[in-house]
């Protein structure tokens, strides 16, 4: 079971990997997500990444974790948050209320150096990742893969 | 419940290595990144590195990068931590650690094995 | 690597004090700090994790706030066993580094 209220809220420009700006553009009253090379003095968009502290048993979860995760949401601009499109396998921004839907909740994972990784809390062992210089929802379907440079992302408070 | 449970005490000459080891019960092994953090005696806590059960990938820090290895067999819930040319400063007490949230360091460590004594003495 | 700056290094106190434990990061960590408890041969004890948040069972007389570089470890009224050393960790980022430690020991 999720929080309700966030334990902290960081905010955040996010970068690939291979240090590529995730962006956020207004286009005919929504917004598309963009992966790109900023220009040297280019400003970052920021995210408000807000986390939560989710405790279960395994057995309830079905994942097979047994104790504390964390749980993040991600607001580029007031009132918009990335959702996964499990249908798609895309990554939105949907504008909505709280309570959040579960879409808009990702596993944090951060074992991986500095590089944190996002799970859908909605299809296990799907990840954001890059593909086609968009994000996109990603299946890893073994551990070693967990690893792949397109589901690593920077954050940073620059 | 949630047990870490670390090889016995080593005496070790200086320049060989030592390989402790730490086998973990109780929970799920590879959701959980697992940390080697040193105490040498009368002294403070010193962060060592991190392996990642899941795919076996590892972060240390840079005073040990190229004397540590860190290891994992995911068959029997077992990390290792081998250092090698050790040094009578590396006298300590090491510990195995477990972080209390799976996938992620952020929320500290909870689970600690009770330590494994390295004396390296000539 | 962030250096974590813990003070004081010991303090002496009675039973019933209130004892406050401070620690400052060398760059902003966010709420990424974690409070630990060791006893002389045992391992440490998480006591506070998030910077506020009470570890489960943990008594409540044990609090934490702040963020970004400054950072308080608050015993509200000290017990006979919270006599032990406090550290201090940045979980923020690798290398994960610890405070010091402050001891804190019977006046």
């Known amino acids: 079971i999720t929080g309700i209220s966030p334990i902290t809220e960081y905010l955040a420009s996010l970068s690939t990997y291979n240090d590529q700006s995730i962006t956020f553009a207004l286009e005919d009253e929504s917004y598309e997500i963009y992966v790109e090379d900023l220009k040297k003095d280019e400003k970052k968009d920021k995210v408000l990444l807000s986390y939560y502290e989710s405790q279960h048993p395994s057995n309830e979860s079905g994942d097979g974790v047994d104790g504390k995760m964390l749980m993040v949401t991600l607001s580029p601009t007031k009132d918009f948050w990335l959702h996964a499109n499990n249908k798609e396998h895309s990554v939105e921004l949907h504008k909505c209320e709280k309570p959040l839907p579960d879409q808009a909740f990702f596993v944090l994972h951060n074992m991986h150096s500095n590089c944190v990784s996002f799970e859908c809390k909605t299809d296990p062992g799907v990840f954001i990742g890059v593909k086609d210089n968009h994000l996109a929802l990603i299946k890893v379907d073994s551990s070693e893969n967990l690893c792949t440079e397109n589901i690593l992302f920077k954050l940073s408070e620059t | 419940q949630v047990q870490l449970v670390q090889s016995g005490a080593e005496v070790k000459k200086p320049g060989a290595s030592v390989k402790v080891s730490c086998k973990a019960s109780?929970?799920?092994?590879?959701?959980?990144?697992m940390h080697w953090v040193r105490q040498a005696p009368g002294q403070g806590l010193e962060w060592m590195g991190e392996?990642?059960?899941?795919?076996?990938?590892?972060s240390y820090a840079q005073k040990f990068q190229g004397r540590v290895t860190m290891t994992r067999d995911t068959s029997t819930s077992t990390v290792y931590m081998e250092l090698s040319s050790l040094r009578s400063e590396d006298t300590a007490v090491y510990y195995c650690?477990?972080?209390?949230?799976?996938?992620?360091?952020?929320?500290?460590?909870?689970?600690w094995g009770r330590g494994t004594l390295v004396t390296v003495s000539s | 690597d962030i250096q974590m700056t813990q003070s004081p290094s010991s303090v002496s106190a009675s039973v019933g004090d209130r004892v406050t434990i401070t620690c400052r990061a060398s760059?902003?960590?966010?709420?990424?700090l974690a409070w630990y408890q060791q006893k002389p041969g045992k391992a440490p004890k998480l006591l506070i994790y998030?910077?506020?948040r009470l570890q489960s069972g943990v008594p409540s007389r044990f609090s934490g706030s702040g963020s970004g570089t400054d950072f308080t470890l608050t015993i509200s009224s000290l017990q006979p066993e919270d006599f032990a050393t406090y550290y201090c960790?940045?979980?923020?980022?690798?290398?994960?580094?610890f405070g010091g430690g402050t001891k804190v020991e019977i006046k």
């Open positions: 650690a477990r972080p209390s949230a799976a996938y992620s360091h952020y929320l500290g460590i909870d689970m």
């Open positions: 109780g929970y799920t092994f590879i959701s959980y990144g």
């Open positions: 392996i990642n059960p899941h795919g076996g990938s590892t």
């Open positions: 760059q902003g960590i966010s709420s990424w």
């Open positions: 998030a910077a506020s």
């Open positions: 960790q940045q979980a923020n980022v690798f290398p994960l580094t």
